[in-house]
């Protein structure tokens, strides 16, 4: 392993998964590295092998149990180390005392569906996946709608500052194809970040009735 600029970032999905990304400038692609997890108040230790995701970036998932099991709490601390093989020994390349509920990134929302669609509006609902019951209602959402001829990056963000798993999109154009995405973030945690965007939901508004004003 080389002493280039490094970055080690991990997130807890609030249930039973810690996902980590390790990057290092100038590191060799075939370097053998792993993440080792050592909790302060649990009987398990966990290791996952870092697998290449790009030229100088590796990732792995520490799977702590069944997807919906609550494996860590707000008082847990898990010491995470990146260990890379150097000859016959392992070298500590990065270390952190990981506080799961300070470093949250939930799974992308799922089960998006059109509840009701009209000419100018559409009501959409979704569900959150593998989210801890600890959050109660302390979640927020961002949503975006892809209009014809635009990119996702150009789509304005709609913010829902509460746990509201539906939205009514208005001022839509009749008989037009749209796509919709949503993401979620807990309010808790200094280093918490947004979930990935959901899979896009495609929908089409109803055509305007003939002879009516649009």
């Amino acid at each position: 392993a080389v002493n280039g600029t490094s970055q080690f970032t991990c997130f807890y999905n609030s249930r039973a998964n810690i996902s980590c990304v390790w990057s290092q400038d100038g590191a060799l692609q075939d370097t053998s590295c792993q993440v080792h997890a050592w909790p302060d108040r649990r009987r398990w230790n966990q290791t996952c092998e870092l697998l290449p995701v790009s030229q100088a970036s590796w990732a792995c998932n520490l799977i702590l149990g069944a997807p919906d099991s609550q494996k860590l709490t707000t008082v847990d601390i898990v010491t995470l180390r990146v260990l890379c093989r150097e000859g016959v020994r392992w070298r500590v390349m990065a270390i952190q005392d990981f506080k799961p509920f300070e470093n949250l990134r939930l799974m992308a929302p799922i089960s998006l569906q059109v509840v009701h669609v009209e000419t100018h509006r559409c009501n959409i609902s979704w569900e959150i996946s593998q989210a801890s019951h600890y959050f109660e209602r302390h979640l927020e959402f961002e949503a975006r709608t892809l209009s014809p001829g635009h990119t996702w990056e150009e789509a304005p963000l709609l913010t829902l500052k509460q746990k509201q798993e539906w939205i009514c999109l208005e001022t839509l154009t009749p008989d037009t194809q749209y796509e919709f995405q949503v993401r979620v973030k807990p309010l808790q945690g200094e280093f918490t970040t947004w979930s990935p965007w959901s899979q896009p939901l495609a929908f089409r508004t109803k055509p305007a009735a003939l002879g009516k004003d649009t």
């Epitope: 392993a1 600029t5 302060d40 390349m93 990065a94 270390i95 952190q96 005392d97 506080k99 280093f191």
Partner: nanobody, 126 residues
Framework: QVQLVESGGGLVQPGGSLRLSCAAS????????MSWVRQAPGKELEWVSS????????HYADTVKGRFTISRDNDENTLYLQMNSLEPEDTAVYYC???????????????????RGQGTQVTVSS
Amino acid sequence: QVQLVESGGGLVQPGGSLRLSCAASGFTFSNYAMSWVRQAPGKELEWVSSITSAGRGTHYADTVKGRFTISRDNDENTLYLQMNSLEPEDTAVYYCAKYSSATYYPPTPAQGRDYRGQGTQVTVSS
């Protein structure tokens, strides 16, 4: 704003001990890795030791290993450096430094430091 205030330096004879303290404020101390660095007269800044945010991991420069001990009290927002068997070569201004996250990188311990204090002078001389 982030504030780091070192204390505990002074004049000590070779073989003696000192305990440095660093009082931290302006950020959630328990969420960040910390370190001690030092600068001897006319020399570059030198890394001494680092500690993880909850104190479960520590690393030391070879020059101080076995003599210095880094620790922290997250309830008191204070970082410590216990220095034993002091040598004249340990004479320097000692700075407490904050990392930009909970992570530090032992092979490149200078990486990611974003704040340091004003320092406290340690002089080892007979």
